[in-house]
Interface confidence: medium
């Protein structure tokens, strides 16, 4: 999937933009808002009626190298009595993010943008029941 | 991708850190993207902590459109379809990386930007503080 180009009238004149080889783009990986932190309610992963666990995947050839994935603990949802209710479903909520992938080819290195699907948490839904004729 | 030569003694000069600026291929590799809209798009309505989706558009960013979730209720929907205020609907937030055109309006020059998005909502038991 190519990055869409907005109508050329929108861009600055070419001379004011950095020169870039054809088929590639310049990417500064010094992150804007690097120190921003998530301000989610405390321990929602264990207080949720569709609780989840976190696992950290680590890859030195990916930037950022750490990606956190959530996993729903249950198939059903936790009811007021603290029991699992299978008439409801815990389902993953997912979000796409970008990472930079470093690839080694002999003594050369190349970089590729990659879209990664992250499971962020879980929510409790009423199931879709298909009635089979 | 665009190949960058390494030092002559490359087997011994493995750089553990990413350089500050890299040249990357214009194509985005999205083999991990297995979202199936017909499966996931109705969770916002079927959830016990339902949410609305708001479109956030910015032509200086890639992706230019991001959907933000806003919980519909303070409480959660119970089995009778009513809002139960003994439980709370709370947003699930996630930091994601996007591309920001830098300098502005340039077609092929970007910087990574971390943004905070609300992806959906979940129903939680409230934290009750007992005041002595």
């Amino acid at each position: 999937r190519k990055i869409p180009k907005v109508g050329h009238t929108f861009f600055q004149k070419p001379e004011s933009c950095p020169p870039v080889p054809g088929g590639s783009m310049k990417l500064d990986i010094g992150i804007i808002n690097e120190n921003q932190r998530v301000s989610m309610s405390r321990n929602i992963e264990s207080r949720s009626t569709s609780p989840w666990n976190y696992t950290v995947t680590w890859d030195p050839n990916r930037y950022p190298s750490e990606v956190v994935q959530a996993q729903c603990r249950n198939l059903g949802c936790i009811n007021a009595q603290g029991k699992e209710d299978i008439s409801m479903n815990s389902v993953p909520i997912q979000q796409e993010t970008l990472v930079v992938r470093r690839k080694h080819q002999g003594c050369s290195v190349s970089f590729q943008l990659e879209k990664v699907l992250v499971t962020v948490g879980c929510t409790c839904v009423t199931p879709v029941i298909h009635h089979v004729q | 991708g665009i190949t960058i030569p390494r030092n002559p003694g490359c087997p011994n000069s493995e750089d553990k850190n990413f350089p500050r600026t890299v040249m990357v291929n214009l194509n985005i590799h999205n083999r991990n993207t297995n979202t199936n809209p017909k499966r996931s798009s109705d969770y916002y309505n079927r959830s016990t902590s339902p949410w609305n989706l708001h479109r956030n558009e910015d032509p200086e960013r890639y992706p230019s459109v991001i959907w933000e979730a806003k919980c519909r209720h303070l409480g959660c929907i119970n089995a009778d379809g009513n809002v139960d205020y003994h439980m709370n609907s709370v947003p699930i937030q996630q930091e994601i990386l996007v591309l920001r055109r830098e300098p502005p309006h340039c077609p092929n020059s970007f910087r990574l930007e971390k943004i905070l998005v609300s992806v959906g909502c979940t129903c939680v038991t409230p934290i009750v503080h007992h005041v002595a």
């Epitope: 996993q71 603990r73 249950n74 198939l75 389902v91 993953p92 | -």
Partner: nanobody, 123 residues
Framework: DVQLVESGGGLVQPGGSLRLSCAAS????????VGWFRQAPGKEREFIGA????????YYAVSEKGRFTISRDNSKNTLYLQMNSLRPEDTAVYYC????????????????WGQGTLVTVSS
């Protein structure tokens, strides 16, 4: 996408045991609910059980509780079905299936299915 390949089927005597495996390809196996169905000759496909992504939550069809055990090893991207005290009526093609939502899987509407492995229980 997820590809599923079952193995371990074969001929077994009544009262015997068998362990079926389902190997999954794809880097996100642990985010899927996975389970087992079976289809006996001339009958409808029948739900056996399912296990959540983390393995903490497992459900069995009431009729099979106790004889069948479902487990998964996310490090090996593999789902298992341990079958004990097998009976002739357990003869069927056994299918491995995966989906991100249990509701779809439970009612036979999973996104991903294996080709099946035949289990024959006969003396």
């Amino acid at each position: 996408d997820v590809q599923l390949v079952e193995s371990g089927g074969g001929l077994v005597q009544p009262g015997g045991s068998l362990r079926l495996s389902c190997a999954a390809s794809g880097r996100t196996f642990s985010s899927y609910v996975v389970g087992w169905f079976r289809q006996a000759p001339g009958k409808e496909r029948e739900f056996i059980g399912a296990i959540s992504g983390s393995g903490e939550s497992i459900y069995y069809a009431v009729s099979e509780k106790g004889r069948f055990t479902i487990s998964r090893d996310n490090s090996k991207n593999t789902l298992y079905l341990q079958m004990n005290s097998l009976r002739p009526e357990d003869t069927a093609v056994y299918y491995c299936t995966a989906d991100q939502e249990f509701g779809y899987l439970r009612f036979g509407r999973s996104e991903y299915w294996g080709q099946g492995t035949l289990v024959t229980v006969s003396s």
